[in-house]
């Protein structure tokens, strides 16, 4: 088992909104849970976009999940990762 590296980035979307993207890379096996939580509960699936789980060329895998949020409300969102029984949560950078 190889645990993922998780990285959260933000980019301007439209006025007053930002897109936050949570990327997991370098993990094996390929089964992974990656999702956004808002206010501590699941963010509805129709407001999240997932990338495919793809090989990254080193025998490991990578994927991502993104969502659009209101600027100034970043604290209310965390990216949740679960892989091979381990988990972590990742805030949106300021």
């Amino acid at each position: 088992t190889v645990p993922p590296m998780v990285n959260v980035t933000r980019s301007e979307a439209s006025e007053g909104n930002i897109t936050v993207t949570c990327r997991a890379s370098g993990f094996y096996p390929w089964n992974i849970t990656l999702s956004w939580r808002q206010d501590g509960v699941s963010l509805s699936h129709d407001t999240q976009q997932w990338g495919d789980v793809l090989p990254d060329g080193n025998g490991t895998y990578q994927t991502w999940v993104a969502t659009r949020i209101c600027q100034g409300e970043e604290q209310r969102f965390t990216c949740y990762m679960e892989h091979s029984g381990n988990h972590s949560t990742h805030p949106v950078p300021s």
């Epitope: 849970t33 939580r37 206010d39 501590g40 509960v41 699941s42 409300e73 604290q75 209310r76 969102f77 965390t78 949740y80 679960e82 029984g85 988990h87 949560t89 805030p91």
Partner: antibody, heavy 119, light 107 residues
């Protein structure tokens, strides 16, 4: 460590309002987190009532939405529960608690305060 | 709303025994589950979060598992301090709801 302490009257008459205070020490309620009220009925059933978060946004249990209000006094680091038009069914031990945004579980609770609704 | 159904409602066990408590959600909660222990006259205390993760300071005789709608809490080699009530709580969506509890009593 975050510490929470509930206070308020132990006896309320039916049709009146129930008002409770949660005093938080060890952490500013405006820094982060969701600050919650949870109650436990005499037969031990637990009910999440609602929260006010670090920015003042509230979220209530729909079963209480027409009767509940959660507010705060940031200068005193306190948040409050008001429940209007109470009945004997609102007799319960009322707890304040908080959760972090990595997940809505409750790591620490106040000691609880029993409120009896009776004429 | 997601309803949480706990079983059994109560059980009697001896010190040293292994006990298992189960919690069923009315919909898939995707491991968004916590367990609490409550002793008589005290506040609930967090035992488990994210379905399987032990909270700080929780003894390793406690373990939790599950997925989808079915979850369980297991206590190996029950100790005197483990007697009390146990509650599950989901945090998949609002409103947050709790199970009705399981009372673990001394046989």
């Amino acid at each position: 460590d975050v510490q929470l302490q509930e206070s308020g009257p132990g006896l309320v008459k039916p049709s009146q309002s129930l008002s409770l205070t949660c005093t938080v020490t060890g952490y500013s309620i405006t820094s982060d987190y969701a600050w919650n009220w949870i109650r436990q009925f005499p037969r031990n059933k637990l009910e999440w009532m609602g929260y006010i978060n670090y920015s003042g946004t509230t979220n209530y249990n729909p079963s209480l939405k027409s009767r509940i209000s959660i507010t705060r006094d940031t200068s005193k680091n306190q948040f409050f529960l008001q429940l209007i038009s109470v009945t004997t069914e609102d007799t319960a031990t009322y707890y304040c608690s908080y959760y972090r945004y990595d997940g809505a579980w409750f790591p620490y609770w106040g000691q609880g305060t029993l409120v009896t609704v009776s004429a | 709303d997601i309803q949480m159904t706990q079983s059994p409602a109560s059980l009697s066990a001896s010190v040293g025994e292994t006990v298992t408590i189960t919690c069923r959600a009315s919909g898939n909660i995707h491991n968004y589950l916590a367990w609490y222990q409550q002793k008589q006259g005290k506040s609930p205390q967090l035992l488990v979060y994210n379905a399987i993760m032990l909270a700080d300071g929780v003894p390793s005789r406690f373990s939790a598992s599950g997925s989808g709608t079915q979850y369980s809490l297991k206590i190996n080699s029950l100790q005197p301090e483990d007697f009390g009530s146990y509650y599950c709580q989901h945090f998949w969506s609002f409103p947050l709801t709790f199970g009705a509890g399981t009372k673990v009593e001394i046989k």
